[in-house]
């Protein structure tokens, strides 16, 4: 058993049918010695008396808020949560496996630049009695500071018969140098509590590996005289690291017809302009990627050919 | 993804082309190592990230863009002395800081070159003959060093009398390649920045 926060305790259980569970001793936080009784949750049934209460915690029915009283007055509370270990592996019931970029990906994180600021998000089908707490650091043995905000509900989607809820959090490394070469990964730890179930999820990454630039901005077309060709131009996104000559991007320019089946013409360039043939009803899209370290491509910025 | 090959103009900063070739070569070598050594811990998540140049050179600090010198987090600089007679830039433009930066890059390349050559000698003794260093990568390191044209004492190649542990050598190769790729990215950024300025 360990303390998650004041008066909230996590009991770790090897989870299988007929498991013996864990013996837990609760102590009433009071100078009183006599006439103390214990109850669980809203029940008035007295579970025991005395300054300490010994219980065998086996299932969720044994978890909850234990309260010690004296003469109708509440002295203190202890909330017991359960953390299930199923055949050596901690349960992951609360969050959905996003399966991207690989199986067992519960937390996904992205950064728009090298400033040390990043966003993480996760999915769940649970709508109520759910709380999250996020901590982060650079490295784990001698951790350096990363400050995270509160996790917030950022999106709701309908997936078949189920509703899916997306939560996200923003974090900022306390003293980040955009040019630094990372040797210790960022660690993100999310505590999740649903009713009386506790779970924790972790993700470990280098900022360089989660970079996804914003799409190029100010995408414009300039027709070339007496030609079906157009000059496409764009700019680096505002959120990208500066100076741009050091943090350079490379770009992919795509001409896409109305029909998804039509052949796509693609050009790769390091410049912020390109000359392409604009077909009728086609659209021109441009996306960006770090020129020197191949992390994710940005989303597309698009304009119609007409 | 193959990086676009830039053909430098005659007046262009001559090291940019070499640094792009270097990044391409080390990225290809790392990809090859990860595929060939799939049963070894060779991914970024599995290896320890060691920097053989730590406390010996200070490339990131010495080559910091002017715009980032205001960022206090970037200025935990280490005192390092370097030879300053580089030839990558037209001599008029070679400021003291630039020379310091380029000589730091040169020292990095020299250190990695020695490590890679020592390692290749061990890998050539492996009866499995599973993986060797790409000669193209070694050649590209050499070309960039020549373009930088710094005079510096030659570091003797390390020779080891004991029987090599091939498993450890292959893991060390992965560690070195990951670190060298990160340094090659920094070198490319620096060359691009110097070329623009």
């Amino acid at each position: 058993i360990w303390e998650l926060k004041k008066d909230v305790y996590v009991v770790e259980l090897d989870w299988y049918p007929d498991a013996p569970g864990e013996m837990v001793v609760l102590t009433c936080d009071t100078p009183e010695e006599d006439g103390i009784t214990w109850t669980l949750d809203q029940s008035s049934e007295v579970l025991g008396s005395g300054k300490t209460l010994t219980i065998q915690v086996k299932e969720f029915g044994d978890a909850g808020q234990y309260t010690c009283h004296k003469g109708g007055e509440v002295l203190s509370h202890s909330l017991l949560l359960l953390h299930k270990k199923e055949d050596g592996i901690w349960s992951t019931d609360i969050l959905k496996d996003q399966k991207e970029p690989k199986n067992k990906t519960f937390l996904r994180c992205e950064a728009k630049n090298y400033s040390g600021r990043f966003t993480c998000w996760w999915l769940t089908t649970i709508s109520t009695d759910l709380t999250f707490s996020v901590k982060s650091s650079r490295g784990s043995s001698d951790p350096q500071g990363v400050t995270c905000g509160a996790a917030t509900l950022s999106a709701e989607r309908v997936r078949g018969d189920n509703k899916e809820y997306e939560y996200s959090v923003e974090c900022q490394e306390d003293s980040a140098c955009p040019a630094a070469e990372e040797s210790l990964p960022i660690e993100v730890m999310v505590d999740a509590v649903h009713k009386l179930k506790y779970e924790n999820y972790t993700s470990s990454f280098f900022i360089r590996d989660i970079i996804k630039p914003d799409p190029p901005k100010n995408l414009q077309l300039k027709p070339l005289k007496n030609s079906r060709q157009v000059e496409v131009s764009w700019e680096y996104p505002d959120t990208w690291s500066t100076p741009h000559s050091y943090f350079s991007l490379t770009f992919c320019v795509q001409v896409q017809g109305k029909s998804k089946r039509e052949k796509k013409d693609r050009v790769f360039t390091d410049k912020t302009s390109a000359t392409v043939i604009c077909r009728k009803n086609a659209s021109i899209s441009v996306r960006a990627q770090d020129r020197y370290y191949s992390s994710s491509w940005s989303e597309w910025a698009s304009v119609p050919c007409s | 993804r193959n990086l676009p090959v830039a053909t430098p103009d005659p007046g262009m900063f001559p090291c940019l082309h070499h640094s792009q070739n270097l990044l391409r070569a080390v990225s290809n070598m790392l990809q090859k190592a990860r595929q060939t050594l799939e049963f070894y811990p060779c991914t970024s998540e599995e290896i320890d990230h060691e920097d053989i140049t730590k406390d010996k050179t200070s490339t990131v600090e010495a080559c910091l863009p002017l715009e980032l010198t205001k960022n206090e987090s970037c200025l935990n600089s280490r005192e390092t002395s370097f030879i300053t007679n580089g030839s990558c830039l037209a001599s008029r433009k070679t400021s003291f800081m630039m020379a310091l930066c380029l000589s730091s890059i040169y020292e990095d390349l020299k250190m990695y070159q020695v490590e890679f050559k020592t390692m290749n000698a061990k890998l050539l003794m492996d009866p499995k003959r599973q993986i060797f260093l790409d000669q193209n990568m070694l050649a590209v390191i050499d070309e960039l060093m020549q373009a930088l044209n710094f005079n510096s004492e030659t570091v003797p190649q390390k020779s080891s009398l004991e029987e090599p542990d091939f498993y450890k050598t292959k893991i060390k190769l992965c560690i070195l390649l990951h670190a060298f790729r990160i340094r090659a990215v920094t070198i490319d950024r620096v060359m691009s920045y110097l070329n623009a300025s």
């Epitope: 049918p17 199923e86 055949d87 050596g88 592996i89 019931d93 089908t125 | 049963f39």
Partner: antibody, heavy 115, light 112 residues
Amino acid sequence: QVQLVQSGGGVVQPGRSLRLSCAASGFTFSEYGMHWVRQAPGKGLEWVAFIRYDGSNKYYADSVKGRFTISRDNSKNTLYLQMKSLRAEDTAVYYCKTHGSHDNWGQGTMVTVSS
Amino acid sequence: SYVLTQPPSVSGTPGQRVTISCSGGRSNIGSNTVKWYQQLPGTAPKLLIYYNDQRPSGVPDRFSGSKSGTSASLAITGVQAEDEADYYCQSYDRGTHPALLFGTGTKVTVLG
């Protein structure tokens, strides 16, 4: 004590369907994940499928994906395996089993796919 | 489709020490715990070892398990006639958990 009692096995022609059941007692069935495992005559153990405690997630072996469906009815304390498009290579003893470091197995039920 | 490899058979005379190996990889045994089962003819498998080296109550102490790196082994010290059975190791793969990964199985024969 924990008990898993299986039923539903038998002889079936290729291409036909069969549903296996596993009735659980002696524990809070709705709190535990469950597996199906099979064993072809004279062969080793092969995992078939898994279902989470609340039925929210199901996992299948590639060899049965798209043909077999694992399900559970927590109000009836029963686990099911719906098998469709049966093949000769599905002939085996099928076991249900609890998920955990200590597990409990059903007695097994024989499924024979033969024309 | 078996990723955990066991010897097809091992044998020993009563009182001898018999060991069965189970060889896997970094993504299965290397990152997860191992179980061992005993299966007597015509019966369901019985758990012998869990969490690599733990014995459930009721399992004789002549059975012991160990794990090192990407391999595990089961030892029967002082093998007895009633130990003649099939033995299976089981683990998980970190990419496909909770799918059970079984070993190929080993037939233990007690001679004489």
